[in-house]
């Protein structure tokens, strides 16, 4: 009778994570007497996967009924495959012996590769906001996929970006892989409503890529523009000065009025007008009793936006000669009117 041969017909098998993997093995003979064992890997460090003789292998089932004498099929099925199960599996025939069974012949091995889906991409932006015309970095990360081949693209408002760098780790063989990509995006004033999208394509996704998004509203700061103007008044002893704060983002804004450098009033922006591009407008006014002033008044609108250094705009309010003559009798009193919204610009 010809010497026993161990036949593993498939060089490789690919299975999706969570499924069962069938590893095929056949013998040409039942001689010599002794058990069949399955191992992952070769050499001294190989891992026992199944032993016909003994042991408890809850994830392994034999494809055929091994207690039937004419059975030469020693294929096994491993349930609930994970990326950690990837490797080369060997079907090995042992000859009964002591103190240990003696390895008689091994199959050529079957490489099990596990197709594992990448995790949902997580996109994160810069830790601090930046202003238009500056470049900010966004990162995209996804983990746990296999095989290694993967495609990552970046988009801003549907337009593909080209300024990015991507790494897949580890560089060598592994049970699963991670991808990390950094994209550089130049901010524009209109980016409050913009989105960056990281798109990942992988064999396990069957043409339906995964996407992670980040809003540029989290990364951008649009500083306000200030305009101080005097509004016409019926009463000749009062002046109405407005400070128009325009096109800023985010909302956080504190405004201070100064008369000749002295703080007159501080207020926090509340009722804002939102522009179509996502920025905000706000207007504050100051009623000045001109009778209280003998000389011209410099009114300053000082704005602190989003914790940044204050910006200001001044307006010189001229006191007429007639008002100066009568002014000495007037008690110094600045009438401060409440703020009122100004129509939003679009």
């Amino acid at each position: 009778e010809d010497e026993l041969q161990v036949i593993q017909p498939e060089k490789s098998v690919s299975v999706a994570a969570g499924e069962s993997a069938t590893l095929r093995c056949a013998m040409t003979s039942l001689i010599p007497v002794g058990p069949i064992m399955w191992f992952r890997g070769a050499g001294a460090g190989r891992e026992l996967i199944y032993n016909q003789k003994e042991g408890h292998f809850p994830r392994v089932t034999t494809v055929s009924e091994l207690t039937k004498r004419n059975n030469l099929d020693f294929s096994i099925s491993i349930s609930n495959i994970t990326p950690a199960d990837a490797g080369t599996y060997y079907c090995v025939k042992f000859r009964k012996g002591s103190p240990d069974d003696v390895e008689f012949k091994s199959g050529a091995g079957t490489e099990l590769s596990v197709r594992a889906k990448p995790s949902a991409p997580v996109v994160s932006g810069p830790a601090v906001r930046a202003t238009p015309e500056h470049t900010v970095s966004f990162t995209c990360e996804s983990h746990g996929f296999s095989p290694r081949d993967i495609t990552l693209k970046w988009f801003k408002n549907g337009n593909e970006l080209s300024d990015f760098q991507t790494n897949v780790d580890p560089a060598g063989d592994s049970v699963s892989y991670s991808i990390h990509s950094t994209a550089r995006v130049v901010l524009t004033r209109g980016d409050v409503h913009s989105q960056v999208i990281c798109e990942i394509a992988h064999i396990t996704l069957q043409g339906d890529p995964l996407r992670g998004t980040a809003n540029l509203s989290e990364a951008i700061r649009v500083p306000p523009t200030l305009e101080v103007t005097q509004q016409p008044m019926r009463a000749e002893n009062q002046a109405n000065v407005t400070c128009q704060v325009s096109n800023f983002y985010p909302r956080g804004l504190q405004l201070t009025w100064l008369e000749n450098g002295n703080v007159s009033r501080t207020e926090t922006a509340s009722t804002l007008i939102e522009n179509k591009d996502g920025t905000y407008n706000w207007m504050s006014w100051l009623l000045v009793n001109t009778c209280a002033h003998r000389d011209d008044v410099v009114l300053t609108c000082q704005v602190e936006h989003d914790g940044q250094q204050a910006v200001s705009k001044s307006y010189a309010l001229e006191i007429s000669a007639h008002q100066k003559e009568h002014g000495s009798d007037i008690t110094h009193e600045a009438a401060l009117a409440p703020t009122a919204p100004l129509g939003g610009s679009g």
Epitope: K68, R69, S98
Partner: antibody
Framework: EVQLVESGGGLVQPGGSLRLSCAAS????????MHWVRQAPGKGLEWVSA???????YYTGSVKGRFTISRENAKNSLYLQMNSLRADDTAVYYC????????????WGQGTMVTVSS | DIQMTQSPSSLSASVGDRVTITCRAS??????LAWFQQKPGKAPKSLIY???SLHSGVPSKFSGSGSGTDFTLTISSLQPEDFATYYC?????????FGQGTKLEIK
């Protein structure tokens, strides 16, 4: 049903011969290692002989050269030809099937009595 | 040849008792050890193979353990039908050899 039935036992004089038969049913005898085990009256079990699926044969020291194990696949039967019988060969002889992969005994016949006496 | 030694040679016990029979091999036999039960005038019955695996149809009150040279057979709760003679056997290499037997009797 898997079954082994021995026959051929009896009374024989010392130096005589006897041929034991074991008819197998419910399985193909040639696919298994097959054995003969004996038990002298009031004594324990003693393995006597075996034949492997490849036709390889094995014997215990005391019967070597006197006993021959064989099988006939067409009849699905196992045999033990016993020559030069001695008084200490007196025993119940059991036909036994070896297990699938490790040759552990799993199926036993009911036994046949061999008495060697003058 | 490999010698197999059983102890005790005989054992008296009561119904419901838990009993243990030991078997020692003269050399390492891996775990190629079987246990058999035999009742008077009957053929032996296979109980356990590879030291701890139960043959089909054998009740779980029978259990085996051991590897190398020392082995045990345990019957967890004796029933009247369990009183018999028990044999161990090594089948790692020819000639296969049996222990001398342990007779389990009702106390």
């Amino acid at each position: 049903e898997v079954q082994l039935v021995e026959s051929g036992g009896g009374l024989v004089q010392p130096g005589g011969s006897l041929r034991l038969s074991c008819a197998a049913s419910g399985f193909t005898l040639s696919s298994y290692d097959m054995h003969w085990v004996r038990q002298a009256p009031g004594k324990g079990l003693e393995w006597v002989s075996a034949i492997g699926t490849a036709g390889d044969t094995y014997y215990t020291g005391s019967v070597k050269g006197r006993f021959t194990i064989s099988r006939e696949n067409a009849k699905n039967s196992l045999y033990l030809q016993m020559n030069s019988l001695r008084a200490d060969d007196t025993a119940v002889y059991y036909c036994v099937r070896g297990g699938v992969w490790d040759d552990a005994f799993d199926i036993w016949g009911q036994g046949t009595m061999v008495t060697v006496s003058s | 040849d490999i010698q197999m030694t059983q102890s005790p040679s005989s054992l008296s016990a009561s119904v419901g008792d838990r009993v243990t029979i030991t078997c020692r091999a003269s050399q390492d036999i891996n775990n190629y050890l079987a246990w058999f039960q035999q009742k008077p005038g009957k053929a032996p019955k296979s109980l356990i193979y590879t030291a701890s695996s139960l043959h089909s149809g054998v009740p779980s009150k029978f259990s085996g353990s051991g590897s190398g040279t020392d082995f045990t057979l345990t019957i967890s709760s004796l029933q009247p039908e369990d009183f018999a003679t028990y044999y161990c056997q090594q089948y790692v290499s020819y000639p296969y050899t049996f222990g001398q037997g342990t007779k389990l009797e009702i106390k």
